[in-house]
Protein backbone atom coordinates (compact mmCIF):
# COMPACT_ATOMS: atom_id res chain seq x y z
CA UNK A 1 0.00 0.00 0.00
CA UNK A 2 3.01 1.80 0.99
CA UNK A 3 4.51 1.34 -2.16
CA UNK A 4 1.34 2.43 -4.36
CA UNK A 5 0.89 5.45 -2.24
CA UNK A 6 4.55 6.49 -2.99
CA UNK A 7 4.63 5.44 -6.89
CA UNK A 8 1.64 7.78 -7.47
CA UNK A 9 2.86 10.49 -5.13
CA UNK A 10 5.90 10.42 -7.30
CA UNK A 11 4.07 10.29 -10.50
CA UNK A 12 1.72 13.24 -9.39
CA UNK A 13 4.98 15.65 -7.95
CA UNK A 14 6.19 14.68 -11.48
CA UNK A 15 3.58 15.81 -13.52
CA UNK A 16 3.41 19.14 -11.44
CA UNK A 17 6.94 19.47 -11.85
CA UNK A 18 7.40 19.03 -15.43
CA UNK A 19 3.79 21.03 -16.46
CA UNK A 20 5.49 23.73 -14.35
CA UNK A 21 9.07 23.37 -16.46
CA UNK A 22 7.00 23.52 -19.82
CA UNK A 23 5.33 26.75 -18.36
CA UNK A 24 8.90 28.23 -16.97
CA UNK A 25 10.02 27.61 -20.96
CA UNK A 26 7.58 29.37 -22.73
CA UNK A 27 6.68 32.46 -20.23
CA UNK A 28 8.58 35.33 -21.24
CA UNK A 29 9.27 36.93 -17.77
CA UNK A 30 12.83 35.23 -17.79
CA UNK A 31 14.32 38.23 -17.08
CA UNK A 32 12.44 41.71 -16.13
CA UNK A 33 13.80 45.15 -16.24
CA UNK A 34 15.09 46.60 -12.86
CA UNK A 35 13.38 49.51 -11.57
CA UNK A 36 15.31 49.71 -8.65
CA UNK A 37 17.94 52.38 -8.15
CA UNK A 38 17.09 52.98 -11.65
CA UNK A 39 15.44 56.39 -13.61
CA UNK A 40 11.50 55.67 -13.67
CA UNK A 41 11.28 54.79 -17.37
CA UNK A 42 7.49 54.88 -18.45
CA UNK A 43 7.96 51.67 -20.34
CA UNK A 44 8.38 48.08 -18.86
CA UNK A 45 11.09 45.51 -20.37
CA UNK A 46 11.04 42.10 -19.88
CA UNK A 47 12.90 39.00 -21.80
CA UNK A 48 11.53 35.01 -22.20
CA UNK A 49 13.77 32.32 -24.12
CA UNK A 50 12.00 32.85 -27.27
CA UNK A 51 11.13 36.40 -27.27
CA UNK A 52 11.32 39.88 -25.62
CA UNK A 53 8.70 42.16 -24.77
CA UNK A 54 7.84 46.04 -24.09
CA UNK A 55 4.58 47.11 -21.94
CA UNK A 56 3.80 50.56 -22.66
CA UNK A 57 2.31 53.09 -19.87
CA UNK A 58 -0.97 52.70 -21.56
CA UNK A 59 -0.73 48.75 -20.77
CA UNK A 60 -0.01 47.96 -24.76
CA UNK A 61 2.41 45.01 -24.38
CA UNK A 62 4.39 44.50 -27.48
CA UNK A 63 6.55 41.15 -27.68
CA UNK A 64 8.67 40.52 -30.09
CA UNK A 65 10.44 37.03 -31.50
CA UNK A 66 13.97 35.98 -31.60
CA UNK A 67 13.65 35.38 -35.72
CA UNK A 68 17.22 34.74 -35.76
CA UNK A 69 19.34 31.40 -34.58
CA UNK A 70 22.89 32.34 -34.84
CA UNK A 71 22.63 35.67 -33.70
CA UNK A 72 21.59 34.44 -30.42
CA UNK A 73 24.26 34.14 -27.53
CA UNK A 74 25.56 30.20 -26.85
CA UNK A 75 24.34 30.82 -23.13
CA UNK A 76 20.82 31.62 -24.16
CA UNK A 77 20.76 28.33 -26.59
CA UNK A 78 22.34 26.30 -24.39
CA UNK A 79 19.46 27.15 -21.54
CA UNK A 80 16.81 26.97 -24.52
CA UNK A 81 18.39 23.07 -25.14
CA UNK A 82 18.53 22.17 -21.27
CA UNK A 83 15.06 22.80 -20.80
CA UNK A 84 13.68 21.46 -24.19
CA UNK A 85 15.51 18.24 -22.98
CA UNK A 86 14.47 18.07 -19.32
CA UNK A 87 10.85 18.79 -21.18
CA UNK A 88 11.12 15.68 -23.27
CA UNK A 89 12.97 13.53 -21.10
CA UNK A 90 10.03 14.50 -18.71
CA UNK A 91 7.35 13.92 -21.11
CA UNK A 92 8.95 10.26 -21.68
CA UNK A 93 8.87 9.36 -18.04
CA UNK A 94 5.19 10.14 -17.74
CA UNK A 95 4.31 8.10 -20.40
CA UNK A 96 6.48 5.08 -19.03
CA UNK A 97 5.31 5.84 -15.52
CA UNK A 98 2.44 5.98 -16.64
CA UNK A 99 2.14 2.24 -17.56
CA UNK A 100 4.31 1.83 -14.71
CA UNK A 101 1.80 2.78 -11.94
CA UNK A 102 0.72 -0.16 -9.93
CA UNK A 103 -3.23 0.67 -9.61
CA UNK A 104 -3.30 0.34 -13.48
CA UNK A 105 -3.47 -2.88 -15.24
CA UNK A 106 -2.16 -3.14 -18.32
CA UNK A 107 -2.50 -7.38 -19.72
CA UNK A 108 -0.59 -9.67 -18.07
CA UNK A 109 2.62 -7.38 -16.94
CA UNK A 110 4.37 -8.70 -14.54
CA UNK A 111 5.45 -6.97 -11.24
CA UNK A 112 9.38 -6.99 -12.44
CA UNK A 113 8.53 -5.08 -15.51
CA UNK A 114 6.71 -2.41 -13.47
CA UNK A 115 9.23 -1.87 -10.97
CA UNK A 116 11.49 -1.63 -14.66
CA UNK A 117 9.78 1.19 -15.83
CA UNK A 118 9.14 2.73 -12.53
CA UNK A 119 12.74 2.86 -11.95
CA UNK A 120 13.28 4.29 -15.74
CA UNK A 121 10.91 7.05 -15.21
CA UNK A 122 11.92 7.55 -11.95
CA UNK A 123 15.82 8.20 -13.21
CA UNK A 124 13.98 10.27 -16.42
CA UNK A 125 12.66 12.46 -13.56
CA UNK A 126 15.67 13.45 -12.11
CA UNK A 127 17.45 13.95 -15.16
CA UNK A 128 14.53 16.89 -16.40
CA UNK A 129 14.46 17.92 -13.26
CA UNK A 130 18.47 18.88 -12.86
CA UNK A 131 18.28 19.80 -16.37
CA UNK A 132 15.79 22.24 -15.78
CA UNK A 133 17.38 23.35 -12.54
CA UNK A 134 20.87 23.78 -14.63
CA UNK A 135 18.59 25.76 -17.64
CA UNK A 136 17.12 28.03 -15.23
CA UNK A 137 20.81 28.01 -13.05
CA UNK A 138 23.15 29.40 -16.02
CA UNK A 139 20.70 32.04 -17.43
CA UNK A 140 20.85 33.60 -13.97
CA UNK A 141 24.02 33.56 -13.78
CA UNK A 142 24.29 35.41 -16.83
CA UNK A 143 21.88 37.66 -15.27
CA UNK A 144 23.68 38.43 -12.41
CA UNK A 145 26.99 38.69 -14.52
CA UNK A 146 25.10 41.10 -17.08
CA UNK A 147 23.83 43.34 -14.11
CA UNK A 148 26.93 44.22 -12.36
CA UNK A 149 28.55 44.88 -15.72
CA UNK A 150 25.61 47.58 -16.50
CA UNK A 151 26.15 49.08 -13.31
CA UNK A 152 29.75 49.52 -13.68
CA UNK A 153 29.08 50.58 -16.92
CA UNK A 154 25.91 52.49 -15.63
CA UNK A 155 26.64 56.25 -16.63
CA UNK A 156 29.33 55.84 -18.98
CA UNK A 157 28.44 58.83 -21.73
CA UNK A 158 30.13 60.86 -24.03
CA UNK A 159 33.15 62.23 -22.27
CA UNK A 160 31.21 62.20 -19.35
CA UNK A 161 28.83 64.96 -21.19
CA UNK A 162 25.51 62.83 -21.97
CA UNK A 163 24.16 59.84 -19.67
CA UNK A 164 23.35 56.87 -21.03
CA UNK A 165 21.38 54.58 -19.00
CA UNK A 166 21.76 50.96 -19.82
CA UNK A 167 18.59 49.13 -18.71
CA UNK A 168 19.46 46.60 -15.72
CA UNK A 169 17.82 43.55 -15.84
CA UNK A 170 16.84 40.72 -12.85
CA UNK A 171 15.17 37.52 -12.44
CA UNK A 172 12.15 37.05 -13.69
CA UNK A 173 9.23 35.10 -12.42
CA UNK A 174 10.05 32.13 -14.82
CA UNK A 175 12.81 31.83 -13.04
CA UNK A 176 11.77 31.10 -9.87
CA UNK A 177 8.79 28.83 -11.71
CA UNK A 178 11.35 27.09 -13.04
CA UNK A 179 13.72 26.44 -10.24
CA UNK A 180 10.37 25.32 -8.22
CA UNK A 181 9.12 22.66 -10.73
CA UNK A 182 12.45 21.74 -11.35
CA UNK A 183 13.11 20.52 -7.57
CA UNK A 184 9.50 19.12 -7.50
CA UNK A 185 10.50 16.53 -10.96
CA UNK A 186 14.06 15.89 -9.19
CA UNK A 187 12.06 15.03 -6.04
CA UNK A 188 9.08 12.81 -7.90
CA UNK A 189 11.97 10.79 -9.60
CA UNK A 190 13.76 10.13 -6.07
CA UNK A 191 9.68 8.98 -5.39
CA UNK A 192 9.78 6.55 -7.80
CA UNK A 193 13.16 5.18 -7.39
CA UNK A 194 12.14 4.49 -4.04
CA UNK A 195 8.68 3.18 -5.21
CA UNK A 196 10.96 0.37 -7.33
CA UNK A 197 12.82 -1.25 -4.28
CA UNK A 198 9.33 -2.31 -2.83
CA UNK A 199 7.64 -2.84 -6.29
CA UNK A 200 10.10 -5.91 -7.23
CA UNK A 201 8.99 -9.28 -6.49
CA UNK A 202 9.96 -11.34 -4.20
CA UNK A 203 10.96 -14.40 -4.30
CA UNK A 204 9.78 -17.89 -2.22
CA UNK A 205 11.41 -18.39 1.05
CA UNK A 206 11.85 -21.56 1.30
CA UNK A 207 11.17 -23.25 4.97
CA UNK A 208 14.03 -24.94 6.78
CA UNK A 209 13.26 -29.01 5.69
CA UNK A 210 15.24 -31.71 8.29
CA UNK A 211 17.11 -34.21 5.71
CA UNK A 212 17.86 -37.47 8.11
CA UNK A 213 21.00 -39.33 6.27
CA UNK A 214 21.80 -43.08 7.46
CA UNK A 215 24.64 -42.73 9.78
CA UNK A 216 24.61 -39.04 11.17
CA UNK A 217 22.03 -36.79 11.92
CA UNK A 218 22.44 -33.54 9.59
CA UNK A 219 19.44 -30.51 9.34
CA UNK A 220 20.49 -28.66 6.01
CA UNK A 221 18.84 -25.39 6.26
CA UNK A 222 18.92 -23.69 2.99
CA UNK A 223 19.21 -20.01 3.53
CA UNK A 224 16.00 -17.93 1.98
CA UNK A 225 17.00 -15.71 -0.85
CA UNK A 226 15.52 -12.44 -1.00
CA UNK A 227 15.36 -10.63 -4.53
CA UNK A 228 17.62 -8.30 -5.55
CA UNK A 229 15.02 -6.08 -6.49
CA UNK A 230 14.94 -7.60 -10.04
CA UNK A 231 17.71 -5.71 -11.11
CA UNK A 232 20.75 -8.21 -11.45
CA UNK A 233 22.68 -9.24 -14.22
CA UNK A 234 19.28 -11.17 -15.69
CA UNK A 235 17.86 -8.13 -16.31
CA UNK A 236 19.02 -5.96 -18.82
CA UNK A 237 18.52 -2.10 -17.76
CA UNK A 238 18.26 -0.11 -21.24
CA UNK A 239 18.76 4.10 -21.63
CA UNK A 240 16.53 5.91 -23.68
CA UNK A 241 17.94 8.71 -25.59
CA UNK A 242 15.83 11.04 -27.05
CA UNK A 243 16.74 13.39 -30.04
CA UNK A 244 13.51 15.04 -30.39
CA UNK A 245 12.86 18.24 -32.07
CA UNK A 246 10.58 21.14 -30.42
CA UNK A 247 8.61 23.46 -32.58
CA UNK A 248 7.68 26.36 -30.85
CA UNK A 249 4.24 27.68 -31.40
CA UNK A 250 3.93 30.60 -30.41
CA UNK A 251 1.29 32.10 -28.83
CA UNK A 252 -0.56 35.41 -28.68
CA UNK A 253 -0.31 37.30 -25.72
CA UNK A 254 -3.60 39.40 -24.32
CA UNK A 255 -2.14 42.00 -22.19
CA UNK A 256 -4.40 44.13 -20.21
CA UNK A 257 -4.60 47.80 -20.78
CA UNK A 258 -3.90 48.53 -17.02
CA UNK A 259 -1.16 46.89 -16.10
CA UNK A 260 0.01 50.19 -14.96
CA UNK A 261 -1.42 52.98 -12.42
CA UNK B 1 -15.31 61.29 -33.51
CA UNK B 2 -12.95 61.70 -29.78
CA UNK B 3 -12.87 64.31 -28.10
CA UNK B 4 -12.13 66.06 -24.82
CA UNK B 5 -13.80 69.30 -23.64
CA UNK B 6 -12.74 71.15 -20.86
CA UNK B 7 -14.57 73.32 -18.54
CA UNK B 8 -14.15 77.12 -19.32
CA UNK B 9 -11.67 79.76 -17.85
CA UNK B 10 -11.23 80.20 -14.55
CA UNK B 11 -10.65 83.72 -12.35
CA UNK B 12 -9.84 82.72 -8.22
CA UNK B 13 -7.86 84.48 -5.90
CA UNK B 14 -4.53 83.82 -4.08
CA UNK B 15 -4.72 81.01 -1.63
CA UNK B 16 -8.05 79.06 -3.09
CA UNK B 17 -8.57 76.07 -4.78
CA UNK B 18 -10.08 75.11 -8.08
CA UNK B 19 -11.44 72.37 -9.66
CA UNK B 20 -11.54 71.75 -13.41
CA UNK B 21 -12.74 69.15 -15.37
CA UNK B 22 -12.13 67.39 -18.98
CA UNK B 23 -15.38 64.98 -20.06
CA UNK B 24 -14.30 62.73 -22.76
CA UNK B 25 -16.59 61.28 -25.58
CA UNK B 26 -16.04 59.09 -29.15
CA UNK B 27 -14.18 56.33 -26.77
CA UNK B 28 -13.91 53.72 -23.61
CA UNK B 29 -13.12 56.26 -20.92
CA UNK B 30 -11.90 53.35 -18.73
CA UNK B 31 -9.48 52.10 -21.33
CA UNK B 32 -6.88 55.31 -21.78
CA UNK B 33 -5.22 57.26 -19.47
CA UNK B 34 -5.71 60.31 -18.96
CA UNK B 35 -2.66 63.19 -18.89
CA UNK B 36 -2.88 67.19 -17.58
CA UNK B 37 -0.10 69.59 -19.21
CA UNK B 38 0.26 73.41 -17.84
CA UNK B 39 1.31 76.03 -20.07
CA UNK B 40 2.24 79.13 -18.70
CA UNK B 41 1.41 82.39 -21.09
CA UNK B 42 4.09 82.30 -23.94
CA UNK B 43 5.89 79.53 -22.43
CA UNK B 44 6.62 76.08 -23.42
CA UNK B 45 4.88 72.80 -21.54
CA UNK B 46 5.31 71.03 -18.54
CA UNK B 47 3.54 67.87 -17.57
CA UNK B 48 1.92 67.46 -14.10
CA UNK B 49 0.65 63.99 -14.10
CA UNK B 50 -1.95 61.08 -15.00
CA UNK B 51 -5.17 59.37 -13.76
CA UNK B 52 -6.22 55.86 -15.35
CA UNK B 53 -9.83 55.92 -15.14
CA UNK B 54 -9.99 52.20 -15.23
CA UNK B 55 -8.69 51.82 -11.25
CA UNK B 56 -8.11 55.43 -10.31
CA UNK B 57 -4.14 55.34 -10.69
CA UNK B 58 -2.53 58.37 -10.55
CA UNK B 59 1.29 59.19 -10.86
CA UNK B 60 2.40 62.96 -10.59
CA UNK B 61 5.07 65.26 -11.55
CA UNK B 62 7.10 65.68 -8.50
CA UNK B 63 6.89 68.90 -8.84
CA UNK B 64 2.86 69.00 -8.96
CA UNK B 65 2.67 66.66 -5.72
CA UNK B 66 0.71 68.16 -3.31
CA UNK B 67 -0.16 71.32 -5.66
CA UNK B 68 -2.61 68.86 -8.02
CA UNK B 69 -4.94 66.27 -7.21
CA UNK B 70 -6.10 64.71 -9.99
CA UNK B 71 -9.39 62.07 -10.18
CA UNK B 72 -12.38 61.00 -12.39
CA UNK B 73 -15.51 59.76 -12.41
CA UNK B 74 -16.45 56.82 -14.54
CA UNK B 75 -20.53 57.51 -15.06
CA UNK B 76 -19.60 60.81 -16.59
CA UNK B 77 -16.42 59.79 -17.89
CA UNK B 78 -14.74 62.98 -16.84
CA UNK B 79 -11.37 63.78 -15.47
CA UNK B 80 -10.64 66.33 -13.08
CA UNK B 81 -8.17 68.14 -11.89
CA UNK B 82 -7.87 70.45 -8.36
CA UNK B 83 -5.32 73.00 -7.54
CA UNK B 84 -4.50 73.78 -4.63
CA UNK B 85 -3.23 77.29 -2.56
CA UNK B 86 -3.25 79.10 -6.01
CA UNK B 87 -0.69 81.40 -6.49
CA UNK B 88 0.23 83.77 -9.37
CA UNK B 89 2.52 81.11 -10.71
CA UNK B 90 -0.35 78.87 -11.04
CA UNK B 91 -1.39 81.05 -13.63
CA UNK B 92 -1.44 79.25 -17.08
CA UNK B 93 -3.65 77.27 -19.60
CA UNK B 94 -4.16 73.66 -18.54
CA UNK B 95 -4.62 71.01 -20.99
CA UNK B 96 -5.89 67.31 -20.46
CA UNK B 97 -4.53 64.82 -23.23
CA UNK B 98 -5.18 61.13 -24.15
CA UNK B 99 -2.44 58.83 -23.97
CA UNK B 100 -2.52 56.91 -26.95
CA UNK B 101 -2.87 52.91 -26.40
CA UNK B 102 -0.43 51.94 -29.09
CA UNK B 103 2.59 54.42 -28.88
CA UNK B 104 3.87 56.53 -26.60
CA UNK B 105 2.28 60.03 -27.83
CA UNK B 106 -0.88 61.94 -26.20
CA UNK B 107 -2.93 61.44 -29.47
CA UNK B 108 -6.15 63.83 -28.42
CA UNK B 109 -5.83 67.22 -26.57
CA UNK B 110 -8.63 69.35 -25.16
CA UNK B 111 -9.14 73.34 -25.90
CA UNK B 112 -7.16 73.61 -22.68
CA UNK B 113 -8.48 75.49 -19.36
CA UNK B 114 -7.03 78.99 -18.60
CA UNK B 115 -6.46 79.76 -15.27
CA UNK B 116 -6.10 83.27 -13.68
CA UNK B 117 -4.78 83.62 -10.30
CA UNK B 118 -5.32 87.17 -9.26
CA UNK B 119 -6.58 89.13 -6.15
CA UNK C 1 14.20 65.24 -14.51
CA UNK C 2 15.56 64.46 -18.07
CA UNK C 3 16.22 68.54 -19.96
CA UNK C 4 15.13 68.79 -23.39
CA UNK C 5 17.14 71.37 -25.64
CA UNK C 6 15.62 72.78 -28.74
CA UNK C 7 17.11 74.99 -31.47
CA UNK C 8 17.47 77.26 -32.87
CA UNK C 9 14.52 78.90 -30.48
CA UNK C 10 13.19 80.72 -33.23
CA UNK C 11 13.42 80.54 -37.25
CA UNK C 12 12.15 82.75 -40.14
CA UNK C 13 11.62 81.34 -43.67
CA UNK C 14 10.08 81.63 -46.93
CA UNK C 15 7.30 79.52 -48.38
CA UNK C 16 8.95 76.67 -50.10
CA UNK C 17 11.86 76.36 -48.11
CA UNK C 18 13.46 73.53 -46.32
CA UNK C 19 13.87 73.89 -42.12
CA UNK C 20 15.35 72.08 -39.92
CA UNK C 21 15.39 71.85 -35.95
CA UNK C 22 16.85 69.97 -33.03
CA UNK C 23 16.05 68.82 -30.08
CA UNK C 24 19.03 67.40 -27.68
CA UNK C 25 18.11 65.40 -24.52
CA UNK C 26 20.15 65.00 -21.48
CA UNK C 27 19.68 60.96 -21.62
CA UNK C 28 19.37 58.66 -24.36
CA UNK C 29 15.61 58.08 -25.19
CA UNK C 30 16.62 54.64 -26.76
CA UNK C 31 14.60 51.45 -25.31
CA UNK C 32 16.92 48.58 -25.86
CA UNK C 33 13.73 46.50 -25.24
CA UNK C 34 12.43 47.17 -29.03
CA UNK C 35 15.00 49.31 -30.41
CA UNK C 36 12.58 52.68 -30.26
CA UNK C 37 13.69 56.64 -29.55
CA UNK C 38 10.61 57.33 -27.56
CA UNK C 39 11.23 60.78 -28.41
CA UNK C 40 7.82 62.76 -30.02
CA UNK C 41 7.21 66.37 -31.73
CA UNK C 42 4.14 68.17 -31.33
CA UNK C 43 3.05 71.08 -33.52
CA UNK C 44 1.54 74.18 -31.76
CA UNK C 45 -0.32 76.59 -33.36
CA UNK C 46 -1.27 80.31 -31.98
CA UNK C 47 -4.46 79.75 -29.42
CA UNK C 48 -4.96 75.75 -30.29
CA UNK C 49 -3.78 72.84 -27.98
CA UNK C 50 -0.74 70.96 -29.65
CA UNK C 51 -0.82 68.41 -31.89
CA UNK C 52 0.67 65.08 -32.18
CA UNK C 53 3.49 65.11 -35.38
CA UNK C 54 5.90 62.32 -35.06
CA UNK C 55 6.68 59.60 -32.84
CA UNK C 56 9.14 56.95 -31.86
CA UNK C 57 11.18 59.99 -32.94
CA UNK C 58 10.54 59.11 -36.64
CA UNK C 59 6.65 57.21 -37.24
CA UNK C 60 4.48 60.25 -38.70
CA UNK C 61 1.26 60.81 -37.34
CA UNK C 62 -1.61 59.27 -40.14
CA UNK C 63 -3.00 62.76 -41.71
CA UNK C 64 0.38 64.43 -40.96
CA UNK C 65 1.46 65.60 -44.19
CA UNK C 66 4.60 63.71 -45.68
CA UNK C 67 6.49 67.02 -45.62
CA UNK C 68 7.42 66.76 -42.17
CA UNK C 69 10.18 64.05 -41.30
CA UNK C 70 11.67 63.22 -37.73
CA UNK C 71 14.88 61.18 -37.62
CA UNK C 72 17.69 60.89 -35.05
CA UNK C 73 18.40 58.64 -32.36
CA UNK C 74 19.78 58.37 -28.76
CA UNK C 75 19.96 62.29 -27.39
CA UNK C 76 20.07 63.55 -31.02
CA UNK C 77 17.08 64.28 -33.11
CA UNK C 78 15.83 66.78 -35.95
CA UNK C 79 12.63 67.71 -37.31
CA UNK C 80 12.86 68.34 -41.39
CA UNK C 81 10.41 70.23 -43.05
CA UNK C 82 10.96 69.77 -46.89
CA UNK C 83 9.20 72.76 -48.37
CA UNK C 84 7.40 74.65 -45.76
CA UNK C 85 3.70 75.72 -46.23
CA UNK C 86 2.07 78.79 -44.50
CA UNK C 87 0.26 76.92 -42.40
CA UNK C 88 2.81 75.65 -40.66
CA UNK C 89 3.40 78.90 -38.78
CA UNK C 90 3.46 77.30 -35.15
CA UNK C 91 5.61 76.53 -32.31
CA UNK C 92 7.41 73.18 -32.64
CA UNK C 93 8.02 71.33 -29.38
CA UNK C 94 9.93 67.81 -28.69
CA UNK C 95 9.20 65.75 -26.05
CA UNK C 96 10.77 63.20 -23.64
CA UNK C 97 8.42 60.11 -23.62
CA UNK C 98 10.58 57.39 -21.98
CA UNK C 99 11.22 58.55 -18.21
CA UNK C 100 9.16 60.02 -15.64
CA UNK C 101 8.57 62.82 -15.52
CA UNK C 102 7.46 63.46 -18.88
CA UNK C 103 9.72 66.69 -19.88
CA UNK C 104 9.42 69.58 -23.12
CA UNK C 105 12.09 71.33 -25.31
CA UNK C 106 11.42 74.94 -24.69
CA UNK C 107 10.26 74.85 -28.47
CA UNK C 108 11.01 75.99 -32.18
CA UNK C 109 8.77 78.95 -33.46
CA UNK C 110 8.44 79.23 -37.08
CA UNK C 111 8.03 82.35 -38.69
CA UNK C 112 6.87 82.80 -42.34
CA UNK C 113 8.39 85.72 -44.43
Known amino acids: MAVTACQGLGFVVSLIGIAGIIAATCMDQWSTQDLYNNPVTAVFNYQGLWRSCVRESSGFTECRGYFTLLGLPAMLQAVRALMIVGIVLGAIGLLVSIFALKCIRIGSMEDSAKANMTLTSGIMFIVSGLCAIAGVSVFANMLVTNFWMSTANMYTGMGGMVQTVQTRYTFGAALFVGWVAGGLTLIGGVMMCIACRGLAPEETNYKAVSYHASGHSVAYKPGGFKASTGFGSNTKNKKIYDGGARTEDEVQSYPSKHDYV | QVQLKQSGPELVKPGASVKMSCKASGYTFTSYVMHWVKQKPGQGLEWIGY????????KYNEKFKGKATLTSDKSSSTAYMELSSLTSEDSAVYYC????????????WGQGTTLTVSS | DIVMTQSPSSLTVTAGEKVTMSCKSSQSLLNGGNQKNYLTWYQQKPGQPPKLLIYWASTRESGVPDRFTGSGSGTDFTLTISSVQAEDLAVYYCQNDYYYPYTFGGGTKLEIK
Open chain 2, 51 to 58: INPYNDGT
Open chain 2, 97 to 108: ARRGYYGPYFDY
